[in-house]
């Protein structure tokens, strides 16, 4: 069974996102992975997309993230582009209109993306074998 190109693109996006730190990757997001035992795969993707959308909507033009140098500004714009691409592809995989995100636990965006990358790589290894 051939892996969906969307899944491949998600992994590539996550690789790009986790390769470089920006001023914003240490900010916190809701940790949906902390207690996701009874959550379906589609719900996980939907909730991950919701968290990402909340993050970039809040921090897209956040002066703390924009930085003081042209390089920092460029990297932040790239981060936002990648988060939006990831959000869109996750919604596509989830196939759900909305999903609740009400966990109290927090993690850094960096750790959130690393965890998501692990999940996506596991999914890829299953569908490509």
């Amino acid at each position: 069974h051939k892996c969906d190109i969307t899944l491949q693109e998600i992994i590539k996006t996550l690789n790009s996102l986790t390769e470089q730190k920006t001023l914003c990757t240490e900010l916190t997001v809701t940790d949906i992975f902390a207690a996701s035992k009874n959550t379906t795969e589609k719900e996980t993707f939907c909730r991950a997309a919701t968290v990402l959308r909340q993050f970039y909507s809040h921090h897209e033009k956040d002066t703390r993230c924009l930085g003081a140098t042209a390089q920092q500004f460029h990297r932040h714009k790239q981060l936002i582009r990648f988060l939006k691409r990831l959000d869109r592809n996750l919604w596509g995989l989830a196939g759900l209109n909305s999903c609740p995100v009400k966990e109290a636990n927090q993690s850094t965006l960096e750790n959130f993306l690393e965890r998501l990358k692990t999940i996506m790589r596991e999914k890829y290894s299953k569908c490509s074998s």
Epitope: I5, Q8, E9, K12, E60, H74, K77, Q78, I80, R81, F82, K84, R85, R88, W91, G92, N97
Partner: antibody, heavy 120, light 107 residues
Framework: QVQLVESGGGVVQPGRSLRLSCAAS????????MHWVRQAPGKGLEWVTF????????YYAESVKGRFTISRDNSKNTLYLQMNSLRAEDTAVYYC?????????????WGQGTMVTVSS | AIQLTQSPSSLSASVGDRVTITCRAS??????LAWYQQKPGKAPKLLIY???SLESGVPSRFSGSGSGTDFTLTISSLQPEDFATYYC?????????FGQGTRLEIK
Amino acid sequence: QVQLVESGGGVVQPGRSLRLSCAASGFTFSSYAMHWVRQAPGKGLEWVTFIWDDGSFKYYAESVKGRFTISRDNSKNTLYLQMNSLRAEDTAVYYCAREGSWSPDIFDIWGQGTMVTVSS
Amino acid sequence: AIQLTQSPSSLSASVGDRVTITCRASQGISRALAWYQQKPGKAPKLLIYDASSLESGVPSRFSGSGSGTDFTLTISSLQPEDFATYYCQQFNSYPITFGQGTRLEIK
């Protein structure tokens, strides 16, 4: 300043090939996905194809799939469109466009366009 | 493919008028919609992205709204340089698609 300049257009017979180029300057080309969009004379805009910043992912409109190939050379800051088996309906102005600074798959910088005419 | 239908197809208005152009998607696209302005013989120019975000350098008389399937572009007070053709574009999924365009003419 940020600029995209297309070249390679011209008149070509049906069934023949043409290669378009798009030279980028004024921005970090290797950090942006790129697109080709076309516009037939007197008609609306039609998205043609897209390539990731590092060339790893490519998408095509159904109308050109199997005939057109998008590629890029980041060392030369240049985007390409190889067009094979050209048809009369491929006649259009071809624009290269950069993905948006803040959002993917929108077009914030456009070239001036290059005209491709497919006619016998 | 997601189809975008713009209305009206053409529109006559005067300088100073408030103008609204609508774009309807054949299925939900969240806020993944952009608006462009194109003048004859020129490349399109990005006006609005993410349904309502104003592109840098674009006058504030342009605004966008909507989510899901219904979107609008509003020009609050038409200026002489605004007479052009306007296109909406969805980027929720591939293939990327455009509306058929709305031609804005001087009355």
